[in-house]
Interface confidence: medium
């Protein structure tokens, strides 16, 4: 069958019909519907929303919509024993206590079940001690403290500002430094953009606003009690002591009003430089402990949260493909929120809902996609990407054989300045071509393409006239599909101007103030940016599911592999003497990249010329494209991170949100000058070069002529 037998309309008209059916007003309506009450993972409210979405997707016309449930480890505050932090005097009396919850936003005063700010999966504990300010608690911040300033965090409670890196990495770093507790806070320098008012008068964080979030270091494991396998009815669960990624010290988040009270008394060392100073009217002294008059006062944490195995629900919708039903294109985003989820995740869920509605409308008119499209509403993303990971673990054999692509659909907006795309290089050309066909929603770009406004506002640092596309890291539901299973993945959303807004994420991220009104009043009153994101995400899914030849260009992988090889080589060349001493050579890697480039070029030529009416040859060529991403998977995984198996990309070991290229080599080289056994350390570098070179060569060979 050719793809036109799947439909009674021409392919070009299909895409136009699909895009024309997407309506901003519907996205707005869906967002409102999804944000009126909290939908915390594991709660009845989120189960009810799952059933509502299941019902609506069926109404929209999907072939089947099922709930997939798992029993996973979640974490909740104790309702009768709230978490807080105190300053205590020498008699042990609490002379200051942090806020027990955020003051509710106007109109939401009587909403029940707003979970107070907490760090999910924090152990219980009531440590008390001197405070040390550790800036962002990054690896380099602890290097500065311990190596340059000779400040010992052992037995101290550290206070770190949110931003720059994933909070779980901060906690891991604090644990490794010997801290006995961690206080996380939002500094106005990072979460209060100059010239903008705080909510409800603007989109900035008020002093009482607090960022919730998990503090796990799962490294792709999913449910901490069932790593590698689904948390189903007959699962064998680890004991809590053997659980993956749980923090070992109490952690709690606060807002900047409370942080002011803790930081204003700090004594000890002055901040090492201006990069350690935020925007509060405090000295940003590092400590340890309080200054002069307050030196006998200590900080005490009171953490009483509990970890509980709880049922979660994914919604999985299927639109069966007419020609290749055994090839899956997946569009997935999460449904669970910390509170109202005005941006995260419901701005994404509302877009997915409208995409499903549009596909359903076409299906009701007699159309079907060439390939099967799976739609997913994931649960428990906020607790460690649990819903998506458990489902992928349960369906891994199908996915690794049939998975064409995964498009992620969390928050549609984190700003309203320009498009932001992170994806596999295989999708670069798809994204470029699609955005050239879409209209820009940006002011000053009326009648211009999205590609044009995006390129102007976010130019590629390497290629002139092209937009920036970033590497995939983690911190979202594509992780298991890309990093573990090697399924080509991508994500798109509207973002802020990173040049002028240096704060981390958006100010109200994971706070109670992330409401429908935040989006409707301040970010996207016309919902035009949401519509554009729907067109990009939906358009990518449409092309991936419907184009006769998969819209992947393997030559773009060749280009980035060369760039990444150059980068890792230059990092290694900072140690020329050791490279000589230990005979470290990158020749094998550069040779493999050269081979990949030549083979990819020849494959692309064959792709232009082959007989597309021959279904066997077509399927063969498409399979080579589909399985290319899979070829970068090392079944043994990265050192100490068995579920990060992609050799070209992994989440940074220092920041889960960021992607690192050739992560095995990068980690082997990191801080190598401080290793006690240099011979062993450089031996590991050589081993990682070998693994990378072999993998690139093996991937290249999957693109060679089959016989």
């Amino acid at each position: 069958k050719s793809s036109n037998e799947a439909t009674n309309i021409t392919p070009k008209h299909n895409m136009k019909a699909f895009l024309d059916e997407l309506k901003a007003e519907n996205i707005k309506k869906f967002l409102y519907n999804f944000t009126q009450i909290p939908h915390l993972a594991g709660t009845e409210q989120n189960f009810q929303l799952a059933k509502q979405i299941q019902s609506q997707w069926k109404e929209f016309g999907l072939d089947s919509v099922e709930l997939a449930h798992y029993d996973v480890l979640l974490s909740y505050p104790n309702k009768t024993h709230p978490n807080y932090i105190s300053i205590i005097n020498e008699d042990g009396n609490e002379i200051f206590n942090t806020s027990l919850f955020e003051p509710p936003p106007p109109g939401y005063e009587n909403v029940s079940d707003i979970v107070p700010p907490f760090s999910a999966f924090s152990p219980q504990g009531m440590p008390e001690g001197d405070l040390v300010y550790v800036n962002y608690a990054r690896t380099e911040d602890f290097f500065k403290l311990e190596r340059d300033m000779k400040i010992n965090c052992s037995g101290k409670i550290v206070i770190a500002r949110y931003g720059k890196v994933f909070r779980g990495n901060k906690v891991k770093n604090a644990q490794l430094a010997g801290a006995k507790g961690v206080i996380l806070y939002s500094d106005p320098a990072d979460y209060f953009a100059p010239g903008v008012k705080s909510y409800p008068d603007g989109w900035n964080l008020p002093g009482g606003g607090v960022q919730r979030g998990n503090i796990l270091n799962l490294n792709g494991a999913g449910d901490p009690l069932t790593p590698g396998y689904p948390a189903n009815e007959y699962a064998y669960r680890r004991g809590i002591a053997e659980a993956v990624g749980l923090p070992s010290i109490p952690v709690h988040p606060i807002g900047y009003y409370d942080a002011q009270k803790l930081l204003e008394k700090m004594g000890g060392s002055a901040p090492p430089d201006s990069s350690w100073r935020g925007s509060l009217k405090v000295p940003y002294n590092v400590g340890p402990g309080f200054t002069g008059n307050f030196s006998t006062q200590k900080v005490k944490m009171h953490i009483h949260s509990t970890n509980e195995v709880t049922r979660i629900y994914n919604v999985i919708g299927t639109l069966r493909g007419a020609v290749e039903p055994d090839r899956y294109v997946i569009l997935g985003g999460h449904r669970d929120s910390w509170v109202f989820g005005g941006i995260d995740p419901q701005s994404g869920a509302a877009v997915v809902h409208e995409i499903v509605r549009s596909f359903g409308t076409l299906k009701k008119e007699g159309w079907r996609p060439r390939r099967t499209i799976l739609f997913a509403s994931w649960d428990a993303e906020e607790f460690g990407l649990l819903g998506s990971t458990e489902w992928a673990e349960e369906n891994s054999r199908l996915l690794q054989e049939r998975g064409v692509a995964y498009i992620n659909a969390d928050s549609s907006i984190e700003g309203n300045y320009t498009l932001r795309v992170d994806c596999t290089p295989l999708m670069y050309s798809l994204v470029h071509n699609l955005t050239k066909e879409l209209k820009s929603p940006d002011e000053g770009f009326e009648g211009k393409s999205l590609y044009e406004s995006w390129t102007k506002k976010s130019p590629s640092p390497e290629f002139s006239g092209m937009p920036r596309i970033s590497k995939l890291g983690s911190g979202n539901d594509f992780e298991v599909f890309f990093q573990r299973l090697g399924i080509a993945s991508g994500r798109a959303r509207y973002t802020k101007n990173w040049e002028t807004n240096k704060f981390s994420g958006y100010p109200l991220y994971h706070s109670v103030y992330e409401t429908y009104e935040l989006v409707e009043k301040f970010y996207d009153p016309m919902f035009k940016y949401h519509l554009t994101v729907a067109q990009v995400r939906g358009g990518m899914v449409f092309e991936l599911a419907n184009s006769i030849v998969l819209p992947f260009d393997c030559r773009d992988y060749a280009v980035v592999l060369r760039k990444y090889a150059d980068k890792i080589y230059s990092i290694s060349m900072k140690h020329p003497q050791e490279m000589k001493t230990y005979s470290v050579s990158f020749d094998s890697l550069f040779s493999a990249v050269k081979n990949f480039t030549e083979i990819a070029s020849k494959f692309s030529e064959r792709l232009q010329d082959f007989d597309k009416s021959n279904p066997i040859v077509l399927r063969m060529m498409n399979d080579q494209l589909m399985f290319l991403e899979r070829a970068f998977i090392d079944p043994l995984g990265l050192p100490d991170r068995p579920f990060y198996r992609h050799v070209i990309y992994a989440p940074s070991s220092h920041n889960k949100y960021a992607g690192e290229s050739f992560p095995g080599i990068y980690d082997a080289l990191f801080d190598i000058e401080s290793k006690v056994d240099p011979s062993k350390a450089w031996g590991e570098v050589k081993r990682q070069i070998y693994v990378a070179a072999f993998t690139v060569q093996a991937a290249a060979e999957t693109l060679s002529e089959v016989a």
């Epitope: 609490e94 206590n97 806020s99 027990l100 919850f101 955020e102 003051p103 509710p104 106007p106 005063e109 009587n110 008012k197 705080s198 409800p200 008068d201 008020p206 002093g207 009482g208 009003y257």
Partner: antibody, heavy 120, light 106 residues
């Protein structure tokens, strides 16, 4: 020194109007919500109205909404309360107060008050 | 609107005695705030967010409570503590104060 100074109080007949002013000094006026709170003779405190940073949002005691208007002029570091159709029960000391935050509603700085007497 | 009821309305206490003032809300509130007012003076912020003492407030004062029931406690009353104390909620508009508790020194 952080200071709030009210003015504009006095004796007015029922049905009359009065405009109270509050001059702020010693802090960045535009960074704070502001409020009026009143206290009838021998009685307790009663919140009258709040205004956000730039005056775009105002909040009133329901029973006063139609007669009282809170406003501000950030350029002049001034807060105002326009009171129309005054009644005997509006007789009180009117305090201008700084609201530390739009949520916590913690009135951390108060003026000395200005007396309004409504009597024929 | 949320009604705050203080008890007692009036209390006459001897120095060094422990004093508790109750504030009951007609529906649950996030936090309670307390102010002290002396005759012919403006109110002064005294306790914010239920349990935190405003700047300059002696440590013999403390605040506690949650939901609908809140308490201001003076551990060992001193003469300078004679005043009227008001509780206030900011959970929802309209903002409301309690009717006040007048503390007199015997």
């Amino acid at each position: 020194e952080v200071q709030l100074v009210e003015s504009g109080g006095g004796l007015v007949q029922p049905g009359g109007s009065l405009r109270l002013s509050c001059a702020a000094s010693g802090f960045t006026f535009s960074d704070y919500y502001m409020a009026w709170v009143r206290q009838a003779p021998g009685k307790g405190l009663e919140w009258v109205a709040n205004i956000n940073y730039d005056g775009s949002s105002t909040y009133y005691l329901d029973s006063l909404k139609s007669r009282f208007t809170i406003s501000r002029d950030n350029a002049k570091n001034s807060l105002y309360l326009q009171m129309n159709s005054l009644r005997a029960e509006d007789t009180a000391v009117y305090y201008c107060a700084r609201d530390l935050d739009g949520y916590y509603g913690y009135f951390d700085v108060w003026g000395q008050g200005t007396t309004v007497t409504v009597s024929s | 609107q949320i009604v705050l009821t203080q008890s007692p309305d009036f209390q006459s206490v001897t120095p060094k005695e422990k004093v508790t003032i109750q504030c009951s809300a007609s529906s649950s509130v996030s936090y309670m705030y307390w102010y002290q007012q002396k005759p012919d003076q403006s109110p002064k912020p005294w306790i914010y967010r239920t349990s935190n003492l405003a700047s300059g407030v002696p440590s013999r004062f403390s605040g506690s409570g949650s939901g609908t029931d809140y308490t201001l406690t003076i551990n060992s009353l001193e003469a300078e503590d004679a005043a009227t104390y008001y509780c206030q909620q900011y959970h929802s508009y309209p903002l409301t104060f309690g009717q006040g508790t007048k503390l007199e020194i015997k």
